[in-house]
């Protein structure tokens, strides 16, 4: 339904508080380097303008699209050329090209300082002095560092952030109350950002059809009692929501997400028995709860899939008449029966089924041709099962840190051209699959592990896309969304790689390592490990383990020494020499 003024429509639907928050997120995700104060000023100007449109929808410029209004506002930033370079050229374009241009310049790895957490008392004072500014600053800092963060979900995080400070700044032990909550929000936020980044990559790089297929599989697992038509409706609506958010249309996205939550709760009887608690919550919590809701129980006595998808004489007729609908039904039926499969596995099975029908429905004997299609699924199912089994055994044997190190070595050997910080970040995240998923029973391991790995490998893909250095990474990232993980798994040592020149500076450490947190110290050691492998890609596990053990002992020894800096200098030289000898550098 058309509105005279889109901006007035969204302001009224969302309310002033959410409107302002979403506009701030949108602006911070586009202009990631702009100071906080500049964004607040722009947001206030947009908000005042929106209020004039609410008062009179026929007022000047109120009929303009949100992209036009927001783009015009962003293009008033005086330092656009100096700060953003060629991004300023976007302002010479007309909509919709201008917005597309802004989207293309979103930076997944912006050159921004690490967020350092102030002392608890300092934070509590800031919170009490100006709660509104404090919370806006949170939105701004997260949004600019995570330009694809799911905006309505960020509102939910901000609400929890506020609740944490409200509660803990009154507590007897503020730090004990607040710090675990902030750690949890940070970790959940990173995970949420990465999950959304995959959704946006899916839409932007592989198209709406790919996203819809993912959504059919996931929603069918989650709502196995819902009819196909119901799942299809939810998929269509969910696709619209994520298309909008990934496209920077955050007001529309948040509004449509609220509508979708409302629809789901009004129709929960025909969707899932698990929604009751979610639907009693306020809007932001409700939407989050629905997105995370556990899978409903599978209906009893579901018939064999073979009847409709292999044995029926109408398979090719049904496929030819409406290919995507028929494949959607196949995916729905398979997924609702298999909560124990990863979504990407289900999509591989659907792709195999589609390829088989494309071939066999043009064959002289179609039924004979596709009769054994389900047999082709067996190796596809067994491959991730075996991989997860092997890696969970390795994780249980090594523990998280050493499991991460094993993956660091594995991935550095596969794609040694990738930057060391990226290899460390990605391998550390890959390694977290162990503690995240291996504790689950068999029936939950694969969906946990492989779908998590898809999220992490997408981080590698988006970081690599910014500065491509490896054809192998590009190939695995672009050829097939659902085969990314098998593609990376199949990579062997890159025999074409010319080892990096040895640089002693890379392996020089100082006393500051002693004051780092355990996590930061691990990252330092893992950075050294990657560099070692880049220097000596043919080094054996045993050689690398020996060097890393010596390195750990060296750090421990020097951190206990009275004159730490002298210890690091003298013992460090010895360690480098010994390591070179051990590795034959």
């Amino acid at each position: 339904d058309a509105h005279k003024s889109e901006v007035a429509h969204r302001f009224k639907d969302l309310g002033e508080e959410n409107f302002k928050a979403l506009v701030l997120i949108a602006f911070a995700q586009y202009l990631q380097q702009c100071p906080f104060e500049d964004h607040v000023k722009l947001v206030n100007e947009v908000t005042e303008f929106a209020k004039t449109c609410v008062a009179d929808e026929s007022a000047e410029n109120c009929d303009k699209s949100l992209h036009t209004l927001f783009g015009d506002k962003l293009c008033t930033v005086a330092t656009l050329r100096e700060t953003y370079g060629e991004m300023a050229d976007c302002c010479a374009k007309q909509e919709p090209e201008r917005n597309e241009c802004f989207l293309q310049h979103k930076d997944d790895n912006p050159n921004l300082p690490r967020l350092v957490r102030p002392e608890v008392d300092v934070m509590c004072t800031a919170f009490h002095d100006n709660e509104e500014t404090f919370l806006k600053k949170y939105l701004y800092e997260i949004a600019r560092r995570h330009p694809y963060f799911y905006a309505p979900e960020l509102l939910f995080f901000a609400k929890r952030y506020k609740a944490a400070f409200t509660e803990c700044c009154q507590a007897a032990d503020k730090a004990a109350c607040l710090l675990p909550k902030l750690d949890e929000l940070r970790d959940e936020g990173k995970a949420s950002s990465a999950k959304q980044r995959l959704k946006c990559a899916s839409l932007q790089k592989f198209g709406e059809r790919a996203f819809k297929a993912w959504a059919v599989a996931r929603l069918s697992q989650r709502f196995p009692k819902a009819e196909f038509a119901e799942v299809s409706k939810l998929v269509t609506d969910l696709t619209k929501v994520h298309t909008e958010c990934c496209h920077g249309d955050l007001l529309e996205c948040a509004d449509d997400r609220a509508d979708l939550a409302k629809y789901i709760c009004e129709n929960q009887d025909s969707i899932s028995s698990k929604l009751k608690e979610c639907c009693e919550k306020p809007l932001l919590e409700k939407s989050h709860c629905i997105a995370e809701v556990e899978n409903d129980e599978m209906p009893a006595d579901l018939p064999s899939l073979a009847a409709d998808f292999v044995e029926s004489k109408d398979v090719c007729k049904n496929y030819a008449e409406a290919k995507d609908v028929f494949l959607g039904m196949f995916l729905y039926e398979y997924a609702r029966r298999h909560p124990d499969y990863s979504v990407v596995l289900l999509l591989r099975l659907a792709k195999t089924y589609e390829t088989t029908l494309e071939k066999c429905c043009a064959a002289a004997d179609p039924h004979e041709c596709y009769a054994k299609v389900f047999d082709e699924f067996k190796p596809l199912v067994e491959e991730p099962q075996n991989l997860i089994k092997q890696n969970c055994e390795l994780f249980e044997q090594l523990g998280e840190y050493k499991f991460q190190n094993a993956l660091l070595v594995r991935y550095t050997k596969k794609v040694p051209q990738v930057s060391t910080p990226t290899l460390v970040e990605v391998s550390r995240n890959l390694g977290k699959v162990g503690s995240k998923c291996c504790k689950h029973p068999e029936a939950k391991r694969m969906p946990c592990a492989e779908d998590y790995l898809s999220v992490v490998l997408n981080q590698l893909c988006v970081l690599h896309e910014k500065t491509p250095v490896s054809d192998r990474v590009t190939k695995c990232c672009t050829e097939s969304l659902v085969n990314r993980r098998p593609c990376f798994s199949a990579l062997e040592v890159d025999e074409t790689y010319v080892p990096k020149e040895f640089n002693a500076e890379t392996f020089t450490f100082h006393a500051d390592i002693c004051t780092l947190s355990e996590k930061e110290r691990q990252i330092k050691k893992q950075t050294a490990l990657v560099e070692l492998v880049k220097h000596k890609p043919k080094a054996t596990k045993e050689q690398l383990k020996a060097v890393m053990d010596d390195f750990a002992a060296f750090v421990e020894k020097c951190c206990k020494a009275d004159d730490k800096e002298t210890c690091f200098a003298e013992e460090g030289k010895k360690l480098v020499a010994a390591s070179q000898a051990a590795l034959g550098l």
């Epitope: 090719c316 007729k317 043009a362 064959a363 002289a364």
Partner: antibody, heavy 118, light 106 residues
Framework: QVQLQQSGAELVRPGSSVKISCKAS????????MNWVKQRPGQGLEWIGQ????????YYNGRFKGKATLTADKSPTTAYMQLSSLTSEDSAVYVC???????????WGQGTTLTVSS | QIVLTQSPAIMSASPGEKVTMTCSAS?????MHWYQQKSGTSPKRWIY???KLASGVPVRFSGSGSGTSYSLTIRSMEAEDAATYYC?????????FGAGTKLEIK
């Protein structure tokens, strides 16, 4: 655009063999069945068989088993039909045709005339 | 194998006249396709999946049928329609063609 270019006319002795080619261009050769059809002068069309270049799968009309052998090569995107133990009955125009979903033939080659004569 | 019988074998029609030719199958088939062939050239797909017109085929042509009985109709005959028309079944191996209906212009 899709094109199927067949090899030239052949004049061969009875008892010998011949290999006819069909060079495909303008589409994903591996993903479509290539069919072969026989047409004798003044006669109707007779389906010989088909090959799927993606994996080499074949279907034959029982009447041509042992007579025709279908092969395909993905790198020059070419399908071949070898006819063996030739007799005058094999004199005909042979046409390759691309098969699509639900079994129709949407593109046809120009035909190769085979004459078997002593 | 399924035998397709086309009738009539030969027919002629005046310009503007409605033309109907049939293809009868010895047992039920899933889909029927029709091809047009003019002398000295390869056949061209004309009607496929029983009733769909191939690219470039004039809308005066139509196809219909199910089971064992299929037909091709020309609403209003034109000189360029003079050719031999073959039906072909899909759904049973081997694929088979009818013997053809030769359509001439009066």
């Amino acid at each position: 655009q899709v094109q199927l270019q067949q090899s030239g006319a052949e004049l061969v002795r009875p008892g010998s063999s011949v290999k006819i080619s069909c060079k495909a261009s303008g589409y994903a050769f591996s993903n479509y069945w290539m069919n072969w059809v026989k047409q004798r002068p003044g006669q109707g069309l007779e389906w010989i068989g088909q090959i799927y270049p993606g994996d080499g799968d074949t279907y034959y009309n029982g009447r041509f088993k042992g007579k025709a052998t279908l092969t395909a090569d993905k790198s020059p995107t070419t399908a071949y039909m070898q006819l063996s133990s030739l007799t005058s009955e094999d004199s005909a125009v042979y046409v390759c045709a691309r098969g699509v979903i639900l079994g129709s033939f949407d593109y046809w080659g120009q035909g190769t005339t085979l004459t078997v004569s002593s | 194998q399924i035998v397709l019988t086309q009738s009539p074998a030969i027919m002629s029609a005046s310009p503007g006249e409605k033309v109907t030719m049939t293809c009868s199958a010895s047992s039920s088939v899933s889909y029927m396709h029709w091809y047009q062939q003019k002398s000295g050239t390869s056949p061209k797909r004309w009607i496929y999946d029983t009733s769909k017109l191939a690219s470039g085929v004039p809308v005066r042509f139509s196809g219909s049928g199910s089971g064992t009985s299929y037909s091709l109709t020309i609403r209003s005959m034109e000189a360029e329609d003079a050719a031999t028309y073959y039906c072909q079944q899909w759904g049973s191996n081997p694929l088979t063609f009818g013997a053809g209906t030769k359509l001439e212009i009066k």
